[in-house]
């Protein structure tokens, strides 16, 4: 059979080899399409409701005035020559429609690096047959599951015209120390071959380095956390990171009620003040990060001091923040 | 909303001629084929004429050929059916149809117009 | 020309009896048929488009159903509402030819 492609909504003339140019013609087409559930006949003399969608013209072809999804299918033409010599004809018809340019809509104009982010989503709609949808960086195609890349994809039909929406969305983990401005495009390949790719307008989103979190250092004087009764304790808690971030503080894995501060100061130290300490730096753009624990504890005179003392009471005591 | 409304029935002596109209809304006229259909006084329901979208392509049964002629104009959202040489037989209440092809059958219909033929 | 043999002609049935009325093709008309519903002085009305399938706003006790030529209108539990006469259509070749019709009578 030879192979037709025909446009959606666009006419189609089929030629019956052999037919005779002008009436009498003995001849006959018979269609297993879509509109059909065996074969249908379709005879130069027949006119009447199959018109609209196939007829045969006076020279012996069929005409479908606008091809439609329902028409892919066979169409086989018999026909007879003044000489009683007989000719088939045999076309195998497939349809397309080349969607609208497709589009990257819910664009991200921010990445962070390092960790997941959704570039986009990119739609193509009123396809057929279906067709794919890729992704490009900087022109190179995007393979989904690799260095970071995941795709979500979703295909719809229109339950009236039968013609495809598809969509496609972009995650990426954009390397540290990578290209700061990365361009993204989309482009729809149709499923039927010898028509080109539509792709859409690139995006460009910045990529934001963010600051490696160095550790939050716990501080404590004296080292070591021991300390006479009565004596003092100061905490310091030391975050590298810029702008300075909020430095909140913990006893024995509870926030203290005091305001935010990087020193804190335990004067007069006294049972109820053992315990173990961290900070909790918070940052805008990060979660919050803790500190390592350090443990205060009281020491008889006479006693040494150990490096790291024994929990003791749950009371505060007298708290001063620098 | 789809809308077909008839009109121009009557009484109408044997032999004599009828022009019927139908108006169409809510829809986009020259999209579709347009059937006429009758019904005689208590009895079934007989077609009596298709055209194409266009109106380039009319169809009827052996019972009206050469004596009634379907047309529309798109223009106008208008359906029409000429009725020459009108028998006692024609008498029937004709609705005008959205559709006759394969890809519609007869959807909507209007609510008909009487057509008497009698001396 | 097509001939569409509707049966039976008439029947007479109670509300939320299940009702069937069959058509029967004289040749293959594909799934090109319609089935309609007409009241006394009105326009008939579409039930079922291409043998199958329910026409918008048509209650869903309607349905139709084909085997090969012969083709069915089933109301699975007739209303007072449904009490009309019933015609199939096939709209496959000219002449579009309908049933004789069917007319459901109160028991």
């Known amino acids: 059979a030879q192979n037709i492609t025909a446009r959606i909504g666009e006419p189609l003339v089929l030629k019956c080899k052999g037919a005779p140019k002008k009436p009498p013609q003995r001849l006959e087409w018979k269609l297993n399409t879509g509109r059909t559930e065996a074969w249908k006949v379709l005879s130069p003399q027949g006119g009447g409701p199959w018109d609209s969608v196939a007829r045969v013209l006076p020279n012996g072809s069929l005409f479908l005035p606008a091809v439609g999804i329902q028409d892919e299918g066979i169409f086989r033409c018999q026909a007879m020559n003044r000489n009683g010599k007989e000719t088939k004809s045999n076309y195998r018809v497939r349809v397309y429609q080349i969607p609208g340019k497709p589009e990257i809509v819910d664009s991200a104009s921010e990445l962070t690096a390092g960790v997941p982010n959704k570039v986009g989503t990119c739609v193509s709609e009123g396809s057929y047959p279906a067709g794919t949808l890729s992704w490009h960086l900087d022109g190179k195609p995007l393979v989904p599951n690799e260095k970071g890349v995941s795709v979500k994809e979703q295909t719809r039909r229109h339950p009236e015209t039968g013609l495809f929406t598809l969509q496609s969305e972009l995650m990426v983990t954009p390397a540290r120390g990578g290209d700061p401005r990365p361009t993204f495009s989309c482009s729809f390949s149709p499923g039927l071959p010898r028509h080109r790719a539509l792709r859409t307008a690139p995006i460009q989103p910045r990529v934001w380095e963010p600051v490696p979190l160095e550790e939050v250092q716990l501080v404590v004087e004296p080292e070591g956390g021991a300390v006479a009764p009565g004596g003092t304790v100061t905490l310091t808690c030391e975050v590298p990171a810029q702008p300075s971030p909020q430095i909140h503080w913990m006893k024995d894995g509870v926030p203290l009620p005091l305001p935010p501060s990087p020193v804190l100061i335990l004067p007069e130290i006294g049972p109820q003040d053992q315990g173990t300490y961290s900070c909790v730096a918070t940052h805008s753009s990060h979660g919050p990060q803790e500190s390592r624990a350090v443990s205060i504890s009281i020491i008889e005179p006479g006693e040494e001091g150990p490096t790291a003392g024994s929990v003791g009471g749950s009371g505060l005591g007298t708290l001063a923040l620098a | 909303e789809v809308q077909l409304v008839e009109s121009g029935g009557g009484l109408v002596q044997p032999g004599g001629s009828l022009r019927l109209s139908c108006a169409a809304s809510g829809f986009t006229f020259n999209n579709y084929w347009m059937t006429w259909v009758r019904q005689a006084p208590g009895k079934g329901l007989e077609w009596v004429a298709s055209?194409?979208?266009?109106?380039?392509?009319?169809y009827y049964p052996d019972s009206v050929k050469d004596r009634f002629t379907i047309s529309r104009d798109n223009a106008k959202n208008s359906l029409y059916l000429q009725m020459n040489s009108l028998r006692a037989e024609d008498t029937a209440v004709y609705y005008c149809a959205r559709g006759g092809d394969i890809t519609t059958g007869l959807d909507y219909w209007g609510q008909g117009t009487l057509v008497t033929v009698s001396s | 020309d097509i001939q569409m043999t509707q049966s039976p002609s008439s029947l007479s049935a109670s509300v939320g009896d299940r009702v069937t009325i069959t058509c029967r093709a004289s040749q293959d008309v594909g799934f090109y048929v319609n089935w309609f519903q007409q009241k006394p002085g009105k326009a008939p009305r579409r039930l079922i488009y291409r043998a199958t399938n329910l026409a918008d706003g048509v209650p869903s006790r309607f349905s139709g159903s084909r085997s090969g030529t012969d083709f069915t209108l089933t109301i699975s539990s007739l209303q007072p509402e449904d009490f009309a006469t019933y015609y199939c259509l096939e709209f496959d070749e000219h002449p579009l030819t309908f049933g004789g019709g069917t007319k459901v009578e109160i028991k």
């Open positions: 055209i194409d979208n266009s109106g380039d392509n009319t």
